[in-house]
């Protein structure tokens, strides 16, 4: 099972949680690519970015994003943890001024342009299976994870623990 | 306030097996990874083993792999070390670590006081 | 599997100096690295994190610098308590422990 429990529990918490810090506690260049070594690419279609999952060519570059790892709080009356309730935020930028973000009301994942400070919408929760294999849990919607469907990124919503170890919700992070 | 507290250390014969135990209390446990670090006589900090929050992943050094064997219990907020073919080379104190952040493997954000394991004929 | 290499393995220094303490990597390791501060007969203390992240509750003549391969810890100013041995740590990919530096009043 992947490295996340009781996901439901959480949800108040995590929409409570609050990010201590206006600046990035580090930010970490990297490619993103799934679970079965697919590349996460950025395509500038129409003004606008478009995001495809797709298995790259032999030497063709991987996309870099810009990933900004910020503190978030725990209330201390929620998790019972006083100030050791910390989670890792994340956002994701792929170029410059543009942020993934997650739209609920379409389940999907998109590139917005906008300033900061970042809207709810551009944080994702780290969850980690270890350094190099991530989760990205919505801020704005507790137990929904960014994931691959139809070779697209999506949200999924993750129910239970037992479907926590789906690779359709786990990332590699590499710096080639 | 944070408190993990081990168990189980003591005088062993090669070959032999030992579990230890850590007790953790004041924050969720079911939320961090724990961890195992050891520290020979004398020595620095060698990292031993590690386990997801809910138990699902495990991650061992390569001198132990195969001999150690971490676990936890959720609802009763342990983790365990199973030691089995102890070595001369396994002696040491032995710390129970929680990581810095929920669901992350990231840092050692609190540590217990550590029990030792000694391991003579 | 990545290798830490701190230097030097013992460093003595006046109260008041400023010290540092370096740690290289085999790999870059995105300033995925912490410090651990042990003194004799206590269990290590996280200092630092992320490479230049303050724990909660530590001096503030204690920071942390770097990236890549090259890391440092610096104590700007001296004091008597800060007698112990320093570890940095990778978790960038798998977990490793530097061998320590012992930090010592002349």
């Known amino acids: 099972a992947f490295g996340i429990s009781g996901v439901q529990k959480y949800t108040r918490a995590l929409h409570d949680s609050s990010i201590t810090g206006i600046s990035p506690i580090t930010e970490y260049l990297a490619s993103l690519s799934t679970y079965n070594d697919q590349s996460i690419t950025f395509a500038l279609e129409d003004e606008s970015y478009e995001i495809y999952v797709e298995d790259l060519k032999k030497d063709e570059k991987k996309d870099k994003v810009l990933l900004s790892y910020y503190e978030s709080q725990h209330p201390s009356n929620e998790s019972g943890d006083g100030v050791d309730g910390k989670m890792l935020m994340v956002t994701l930028s792929p170029t410059k001024d543009f942020w993934l973000h997650a739209n609920n009301k379409e389940h999907s994942v998109e590139l917005h342009k906008c300033e900061k400070p970042l809207p709810d919408q551009a944080f994702f929760v780290l969850h980690n299976m270890h350094s190099n294999c991530v989760s990205f849990e919505c801020k704005t919607d507790p137990g929904v994870f960014i994931g691959v469907k139809d070779n697209h990124l999506a949200l999924i919503k993750v129910d239970s623990s037992e479907n926590l170890c789906t690779e359709n919700i786990l990332f590699k992070l590499s710096e080639t | 306030e944070v408190q993990l507290v081990e168990t189980g250390g003591g005088l062993v014969q090669p070959g032999r097996s030992l579990k230890l135990s850590c007790v953790a209390s004041g924050f969720t446990f079911s939320n961090y990874w724990m961890y195992w670090i050891r520290q020979a006589p004398g020595m620095g900090l060698e990292w031993v083993s590690s386990i997801n929050n809910d138990g699902g992943n495990t991650y061992y050094l390569d001198s132990v792999k195969g001999r150690f064997t971490i676990s936890r219990n959720n609802a009763e907020n342990t983790v365990y070390l199973q030691m089995n073919s102890l070595r001369s080379e396994d002696t040491a104190t032995y710390y129970c670590a929680r990581g810095h952040y929920y669901y992350s493997s990231y840092s050692f954000g609190s540590w217990g006081q550590g029990t030792l394991v000694t391991v003579s004929s | 599997d990545i290798q830490m290499t701190q230097s030097p393995s013992v460093l003595s220094a006046s109260v008041g100096d400023r010290v540092t303490l370096s740690c290289k990597a085999s790999h870059n390791i995105n300033k995925h690295l912490d410090w651990y501060q042990q003194k004799v007969g206590e269990a290590p203390k996280l200092l630092i994190y992320?490479?230049?992240n303050l724990q909660t509750g530590i001096p503030s003549r204690f920071s942390g610098s770097g990236s890549g391969t090259d890391y440092t810890l610096t104590i700007s100013s001296l004091q008597p308590e800060d007698v112990a041995t320093y570890f940095c740590f990778q978790y960038n990919s798998g977990w490793t422990f530097g061998q320590g530096t012992k930090v010592e009043i002349k």
């Open positions: 992320f490479t230049n």
